[in-house]
């Protein structure tokens, strides 16, 4: 299968600012790429075929070029309906392979997360299962490490996290962590703990609590 | 290990500009992100701007980042040829008054600050 690199994952800009997004084949495809923009819970919207054909109804500030491995799409000057994500696509082969997508997001100013821990409620430890929830408030740029320490030891492989979008108003992301362990897991240990790092933390953050006592 | 050193602090006129360098050594191809933070005293550090020096595979290499005390006043640049940072720091306030720190995060661990300078003083008189 033809592979497609895309890069950046995550573009942050600025109205008028032009930015460009490249998309690498693993071999050849000579200009058989298109570029779609999605928004969330929306479909996939075509803006280039051919890898420099404009689509029908596309404003001209989108530009495709390359050919060979190598294509870039181009907006001249960002406007704000252009924040979203944009992905690339091969059709020289049957695979139609994508890439993983860049997130063209709104340049804010770095703000460093708010961090809360939450222990399971009485409810849930009744059915068995244990979540314990980190969340993350109001934080920018969207990089942000979660660490999991359970009576100090590193945990990994039993939590998820969910992101939100990009707050419109504040440029901001919140982030939540879930631990998820068995209740019987849950009671044999006291002290949990999330370490959170970002850019704007000059150290890391962490909170914590001893079951039984919150 | 990476080591950092800041200069270029001093006093200077409100309104006035000043330079800060940072100069890193040792394991540099390892630094992510470079930043500056500031300290005044009896406050906690607080984040000024940060460059993407080495591009992982999240922002472009050279992708700036601002505090709001920053935004609009102060530059971060970098020059990789030298290993050296730069923040620039125009229209200066008594406010800015504080100790500057270098800081820079590994590819290994990008959101984390493992590596700090000693800190270079910049007084703002009215």
């Known amino acids: 299968d033809i592979q497609m690199t895309q890069s950046p994952s995550t573009l942050s800009a600025s109205v008028g600012d032009r930015v460009t997004i490249t998309c690498r084949a693993s071999q050849s495809i000579n200009t058989w790429l298109a570029w779609y923009q999605q928004k969330p819970g929306k479909a996939p919207k075509l803006l280039m075929y051919k890898a420099s054909s404009l689509e029908s109804g596309v404003p001209s500030r989108f530009i495709g070029s390359g050919s060979g491995t190598e294509f870039t799409l181009t907006i001249s000057s960002l406007q704000p309906d252009d924040f979203a994500t944009y992905y690339c696509q091969q059709y020289n082969s049957d695979s139609k392979m994508f890439g993983q997508g860049t997130k063209v997001e709104v340049k804010g100013t770095v703000a460093a997360p708010s961090v809360f821990i939450f222990p399971p409620s009485d409810e849930q430890l009744k059915s068995g299962t244990a979540s314990v929830v980190c969340l993350l408030n109001n934080f920018y740029p969207r990089e942000a490490k979660v660490q999991w320490k359970v009576d100090n030891a590193l945990q990994s492989g039993n939590s998820q996290e969910s992101v939100t979008e990009q707050d419109s108003k504040d440029s901001t992301y919140s982030l939540s962590s879930t631990l998820t362990l068995s209740k019987a897991d849950y009671e044999k240990h006291k002290v949990y703990a999330c370490e959170v790092t970002h850019q704007g933390l000059s150290s890391p953050v962490t909170k914590s609590f001893n079951r039984g006592e919150c | 290990q990476v080591q950092l050193q800041e200069s270029g602090g001093g006093l200077v006129q409100a309104g006035g500009s000043l330079r800060l360098s940072c100069t890193a050594s040792?394991?540099?191809?390892?630094?992510?992100?470079m930043a500056w933070f500031r300290q005044a005293p009896g406050k906690e550090r607080e984040f000024v701007a940060s460059?993407?020096?080495?591009?992982?595979?999240?922002?472009?290499?050279?992708?700036?980042f601002y505090g709001d005390s920053a935004e609009g006043r102060f530059t971060i640049s970098n020059d990789n040829a030298r290993n050296t940072g730069y923040l620039q720091m125009n229209s200066l306030k008594p406010e800015d008054t504080a100790v500057y720190y270098c800081?820079?995060?590994?590819?290994?661990?990008?959101?984390?600050?493992?590596?700090w300078g000693q800190g270079t003083q910049v007084t703002v008189s009215s």
């Open positions: 800081a820079a995060t590994s590819l290994e661990n990008p959101t984390r600050y493992d590596y």
């Open positions: 460059i993407i020096w080495t591009g992982g595979t999240t922002y472009y290499a050279g992708t700036t």
């Open positions: 040792g394991r540099t191809s390892s630094i992510h992100l």
